[in-house]
Interface confidence: low
């Protein structure tokens, strides 16, 4: 996954920046080699009214956010694009309460992709909104190296190869 500055999205805490503050996050290299140009505005489109948000059909609502759980399996980057095309993003977990909600709604014990990957530019784990992981709340089991992406299983976060195919969770 090639993303300029390692920052995929700029949406923070459910409120979007002014249009003048949007930045182009650069080209996303998808597994099949095609490239797409992604704007932060795409992500932020549905995030302006968290508390009164109406979730689309088949999406679950929790604390002002909407969640969609996949049944098929994709690589991390394909999962990322899938969510983005639906005006959402891969799951960003803010606290243990949200993690508990996610686990309650996962109907299988397999790994599930979330919106966290290791950016070689920053040499750190970064959520898809550009924020670093809060080590006081979460830690990642496994290698912290290039081409590592995060998946959850049983309330734990694991480092897995980004090309692995797992189910995923979209959020807006």
């Amino acid at each position: 996954l090639l993303v300029s500055q390692g920052v995929l999205l700029k949406c923070q805490k459910g409120s979007c920046s002014n249009a003048t503050q949007y930045e182009d996050t650069g080209d996303l290299k998808v597994n099949n080699g095609t490239r797409r140009n992604i704007s932060n505005k795409d992500l932020c489109a549905s995030r302006s009214a968290d508390q009164t948000v109406l979730c689309q059909s088949e999406w679950l609502k929790y604390q002002g956010k909407c969640y969609w759980f996949s049944n098929e399996m994709k690589s991390w980057s394909d999962s990322y694009v899938y969510c983005l095309e639906r005006k959402s993003h891969l799951l960003i977990i803010h606290d243990q309460l949200e993690m508990a909600f996610i686990q309650k709604n996962l109907r299988q014990l397999n790994y599930v992709w979330i919106g966290l990957n290791f950016t070689s530019l920053k040499m750190t784990w970064t959520w898809v909104d550009g924020s670093p992981i809060d080590s006081k709340i979460f830690f990642i089991k496994g290698p912290a190296k290039e081409n590592s992406c995060a998946a959850i299983k049983e309330s734990k976060i694991f480092s897995e190869t980004c090309s692995s195919v797992f189910k995923w969770i979209c959020q807006y």
Epitope: D134, I137, F139, K141, G142, P143, A144
Partner: antibody, heavy 114, light 110 residues
Framework: SVEESGGRLVTPGTPLTLTCTVS????????MSWVRQAPGKGLEYIGI?????DTSYATWAKGRFTISKTSTTVDLEITSPTTEDTATYFC??????????????WGQGTLVTV | DYDMTQTPASVEVAVGGTVTINCQAS??????LAWYQQKPGQPPKLLIY???DLASGVPSRFKGSGSGKQFTLTISGVECADAATYYC????????????FGGGTEVVVK
């Protein structure tokens, strides 16, 4: 590097604090563990402190040990030592930052005799 | 609880031979297993992490394998310098554990 200190001969029931001093890396990004080894015995995990300061202990070690840290040191307090606590105490750093799973960097250990 | 059982407790091997050490977890730990070598008077040294990845500077004659509950450390072409005690360690769960480490295997090189 990591270096343990504070080991000495202590009488039973007298609290003792061991210190692990680190250099070359930041405790704000690495998890640190304490492991001990009684003479002629195997390795015994005591507990761990996360990069964020959270602690976790082996079941047998809860209440008997307290792990804390500053910006450059990790302390292990043996709250009320018994003769069974006689051992070499090692401080170890995880291989990965902001994670744990395997201990890559070890100190030489400090000997505690109760 | 995640208990680690290591076998054998001791093994003798001739120089140039092969030695196999087994480690069994009481519950599945995926691939979160490490192997260490310890010589008298020294701290442990990480050999293998994530079940099969060789730590930096470790000779390729050391090989880790397995996943789930069963793991193996194989030392091929044993050298005198390999005489040590070897420990496995689970890196999956740090809560409600008695010990992360197996009981150890002493390797004696003849």
């Amino acid at each position: 590097s990591v270096e343990e200190s504070g080991g000495r001969l202590v009488t039973p029931g007298t609290p003792l604090t061991l210190t692990c001093t680190v250099s070359g890396f930041s405790l704000s990004t690495y998890w640190m563990s304490w492991v001990r080894q009684a003479p002629g015995k195997g390795l015994e995990y005591i507990g761990i402190i996360s990069s964020g300061g959270d602690t976790s202990y082996a079941t047998w070690a809860k209440g008997r040990f307290t792990i804390s840290k500053t910006s450059t040191t990790v302390d292990l307090e043996i709250t009320s030592p018994t003769t069974e606590d006689t051992a070499t105490y090692f401080c170890a750093r995880d291989r990965n930052s902001n994670s744990w799973g395997s201990f890559y960097l070890w100190g030489q250990g400090t000997l505690v005799t109760v | 609880d995640y208990d680690m059982t290591q076998t054998p407790a001791s093994v003798e091997v001739a120089v140039g031979g092969t030695v196999t050490i087994n480690c069994q977890a009481s519950q599945s730990i995926n691939s979160w297993l490490a192997w260490y070598q310890q010589k008298p008077g020294q701290p442990p040294k990480l050999l293998i992490y994530d079940a099969s990845d060789l730590a930096s500077g470790v000779p390729s004659r050391f090989k880790g394998s397995g996943s789930g509950k069963q793991f193996t450390l194989t030392i091929s072409g044993v050298e005198c310098a390999d005489a040590a005690t070897y420990y496995c360690q689970q890196g999956y769960s740090d809560s409600d554990v008695e010990n992360l480490f197996g009981g150890g295997t002493e390797v004696v090189v003849k």
